[in-house]
């Protein structure tokens, strides 16, 4: 028998520095977690103790903090090189700055193979990107060879900016021939490493003949065997065992997100490359693990540029940006409108001639808007200003919901109106009318939504049975502020870009902004 240790991360999302327990900015260092310096300590400890170790990343290193905003992926290549990752799969967020924003900072600088078998380049891009990412890589590990085959969510064109010259094929269809090829070349230990979410990971384990282990990402899935060490609730045991269609037991793993855990899986293979056993657990990277001093020193050196960036002007406002709780928790506020407009603008994807865009709607809990911005400071807006408005380090995500769920969400928005509670919704691409004289749960008297399958966008009444795409904060997607119906009834959830980054990009693009209160949210006469 031959034993392999797989160390894995996924959805790190720019958390190069240690973070608080909820993966936001580290405040009390003695209770902080993760970060590349701490990760390196643990990885090196395991590499020294065990003979056959692979360090793998399942995508979405890009996007999530000011580190990515400023360094645009150069930080990913630099620190992943320093940690000596063995391979990485492309995630959807790796395309957030377009193909060029992937090629230059990461693909050309990474000193580890970057993989995806289901992304095919065409047209002029084919020769430009040739060899910069691979469908698979065969790695020598100890006295054996291991094949790593990559995959990426085929939804990426709707979630990011890969352009028109990359085709995202069905994962299973693309993986099978690559695995078959490796088998014919006597590579009998194969890991599928990719970024399509836990459901697809399980399908790959079930359907792709010859895959021995699946290491996934995208869905931020936390798996654990035994008592979990922090706040995350396990979605299943680690590893999650799938019985393949040809009768094999295939371990599937994922390691939550944000570099909080290091996935640790031990696999035992027989001489024919069959998995005999698999066991392990994610390792919580808490403060009991010291940060490596040399990596930490490097982080501090790179940090300097971030502090300078925070105070630079992104753009100007010529109006007061009302982000006060007195406004945003009671009525339409122009800060809410600005943020929602930025959220939609960030998700413009012309992937189908029938649609002007794939999504037109935004909802945003008023309680998530934490500060106004005064225009009387020469109109200047900085990252620092935006960090005061959106201090929680969240993301603006894409969900699919039925109209009936949206209706429930808007009823919840005003079910206890007047108490300055955070669930009051700010909107974009939606016209809502409330009648507060009616009883809670029956206060939405009009709900019109902007069409997507149209050449001239207009507002139509919400249809209860129709499925709609909506951009919203991850906080709401996860049922925050009492929006349990969203969490329970959503049909799809893809995590998006860092909230501050979305707004800052929009302001930089617009240069001068003047959001108004324009009647997106109304109250019936006599009721307010």
């Amino acid at each position: 028998a031959w034993e392999l240790t797989i160390l894995h991360t996924n959805d790190v999302h720019s958390r190069l520095e240690q973070t608080s327990e909820d993966s936001s900015k580290c405040v009390n260092a003695s209770r902080c977690m993760g970060g590349v310096a701490r990760l390196f300590t643990k990885v090196q400890q395991i590499r020294r103790a065990e003979p056959n170790v692979l360090l793998l990343d399942a995508g979405d290193q890009y996007q999530g903090t000011i580190w990515f905003t400023v360094y645009k992926g150069a930080e990913v290549a630099h620190f992943m090189n320093a940690l000596r990752y063995d391979a990485m799969a492309l995630g959807n967020h790796e395309f957030d700055n377009g193909v060029e924003g992937l090629i230059e900072p990461l693909l050309k600088e990474a000193k580890f193979p970057i993989l995806s078998a289901n992304i095919k380049a065409k047209g002029p891009l084919a020769s430009q990107i040739s060899g910069l990412y691979l469908p698979y890589k065969v790695l020598p590990v100890g006295d054996e060879v291991v094949g790593i085959v990559g995959y990426t969510s085929k939804e990426t064109p709707f979630l990011s900016n890969p352009g028109t010259n990359l085709v995202f094929e069905d994962e299973i269809t693309a993986l099978q021939p690559e695995v078959d090829k490796l088998k014919t070349l006597n590579v009998n230990k194969i890991i599928a490493l990719g970024h399509s979410g836990f459901e697809m990971d399980k399908l790959i384990a079930q359907k792709v003949r010859g895959v021995d282990v699946v290491v996934g990402g995208h869905s931020n899935t936390f798996l654990y065997t035994g008592n979990p060490p922090s706040k995350e609730v396990p979605a299943g045991k680690y590893p999650f065992i799938v019985t393949s269609d040809d009768g094999r037991k295939v371990p599937v793993v994922q390691a939550y997100a944000f570099g909080k855990y290091l996935g640790y899986l031990k696999i035992e293979f027989d001489e024919r490359g069959n998995v005999i056993s698999s066991h392990g657990n994610p390792i919580l990277l808490n403060s009991s693990i010291p940060e490596d001093p040399s990596i930490k020193a490097d982080i501090n050196k790179w940090r300097i540029k971030l502090d300078n960036y925070s105070t630079q002007e992104l753009g100007k406002t010529i109006v007061y940006l009302d982000g006060s709780s007195q406004s945003c928790r009671f009525r339409e506020c122009n800060m809410g409108n600005l943020i929602c407009d930025a959220m939609i603008n960030n998700n413009l994807r012309h992937t189908d001639e029938m649609f002007w865009n794939h999504v037109s709607m935004c909802i945003l809990n008023g309680g998530g808007i934490r500060s106004p911005i005064d225009e009387r400071n020469n109109g200047t807006i900085t990252w620092e200003n935006l960090a005061a408005v959106l201090p929680f380090g969240g993301t603006f995500d894409l969900v699919q919901l039925k109209g009936s769920t949206l209706k429930k969400a808007f009823e919840h928005s005003v079910h206890r109106y007047g108490q300055s509670t955070g669930e009051f919704l700010q909107v974009g691409g939606i016209h809502v009318v409330y009648d507060l004289s009616r009883k809670p749960g029956d206060r939405v008297v009009k709900l019109d939504v902007l069409c997507t399958k149209c050449r001239v966008p207009s507002y139509d009444p919400l249809k209860m049975d129709e499925v709609y795409k909506v951009i919203l904060p991850n906080f709401l997607a996860n049922g925050g502020d009492g929006f349990q119906m969203i969490k329970d009834e959503l049909l799809r959830h893809d995590s998006g870009d860092q909230d501050i980054n979305v707004v800052s990009t929009y302001i930089s693009k617009m240069k001068v902004i003047y959001p108004a209160v324009e009647g997106r949210i109304k109250f019936s006469t006599g009721s307010h």
């Epitope: 590499r47 040739s130 691979l134 469908p135 065969v138 100890g142």
Partner: antibody, heavy 118, light 107 residues
Framework: QVQMKQSGAEVKKPGASVKVSCKAS????????MDWVRQAPGQRLEWMGD????????IYNQKFKGRVTITIDTSASTAYMELSSLRSEDTAVYYC???????????WGQGTLVTVSS | DIQMTQSPSSMSASVGDRVTITCKAS??????LSWYQQKPGKAPKTLIY???RLIDGVPSRFSGSGSGTDFTLTISSLQYEDMATYYC?????????FGQGTKLEIK
């Protein structure tokens, strides 16, 4: 700068063994695998095997059917290639070559001529 | 094992010429191809890896291209010091295999 310095030429009888050394300098020895390649007179280059200096893990070309053994001494930043049961067709120049992150050979030793003759 | 076939086996060209050497793999090798230059009595020198990535310090007149099974080494403007034998190597899978070499002479 990266350098690989190999041991000197050897003359061996058929059936004997030869051990060639390769001392690396100018980089962290454990950061890169080491490959061994040979070239018989007038022939193409032929890959023999690979070693990982971190754990001594080796992968060999099956053509050499257990005749080749690659080892390392990390404290001396040195790799060794031993070929046993020598025959006349093993007369060749033997090269060590460091591999880069992509496992492609990038820096080569100067070569060691091994002559097998009765 | 994967077979690597180079063409031509030998060629001669003049200083300043554009020179192209091809290498064909018996199956798709996933861009895992490198090129080496060997002068008589010397160790090989690596020029290119991953089909098109130039090794640091190699003159920019050398370039690599290709994918799948067909690869090309191009010298944009031949120099006298480029007289050598050139080898391709596939390192996609084990065992690594070399082409038979292309001997380049100066007219």
């Amino acid at each position: 700068q990266v350098q690989m310095k190999q041991s000197g030429a050897e003359v061996k009888k058929p059936g004997a063994s030869v051990k060639v050394s390769c001392k690396a300098s100018g980089y962290t020895f454990t950061d890169s695998n080491m490959d061994w390649v040979r070239q018989a007179p007038g022939q193409r280059l032929e890959w023999m095997g690979d070693i990982n200096p971190n754990n001594g893990g080796t992968i060999y070309n099956q053509k050499f059917k257990g005749r080749v053994t690659i080892t390392i001494d990390t404290s001396a930043s040195t790799a060794y290639m031993e070929l046993s049961s020598l025959r006349s067709e093993d007369t060749a120049v033997y090269y060590c070559a460091r591999t880069n992150w992509d496992y492609a050979m990038d820096y080569w030793g100067q070569g060691t001529l091994v002559t097998v003759s009765s | 094992d994967i077979q690597m076939t180079q063409s031509p086996s030998s060629m001669s060209a003049s200083v300043g010429d554009r020179v192209t050497i091809t290498c064909k793999a018996s199956q798709d090798i996933n861009s895992q191809l490198s090129w080496y230059q060997q002068k008589p009595g010397k160790a090989p020198k690596t020029l290119i890896y991953r089909a098109n990535r130039l090794i640091d310090g190699v003159p920019s007149r050398f370039s690599g291209s290709g994918s799948g099974t067909d690869f090309t080494l191009t010298i944009s403007s031949l120099q006298y010091e480029d007289m050598a034998t050139y080898y391709c190597l596939q390192y996609d899978v084990f065992p690594r295999t070399f082409g038979q070499g292309t001997k380049l002479e100066i007219k």
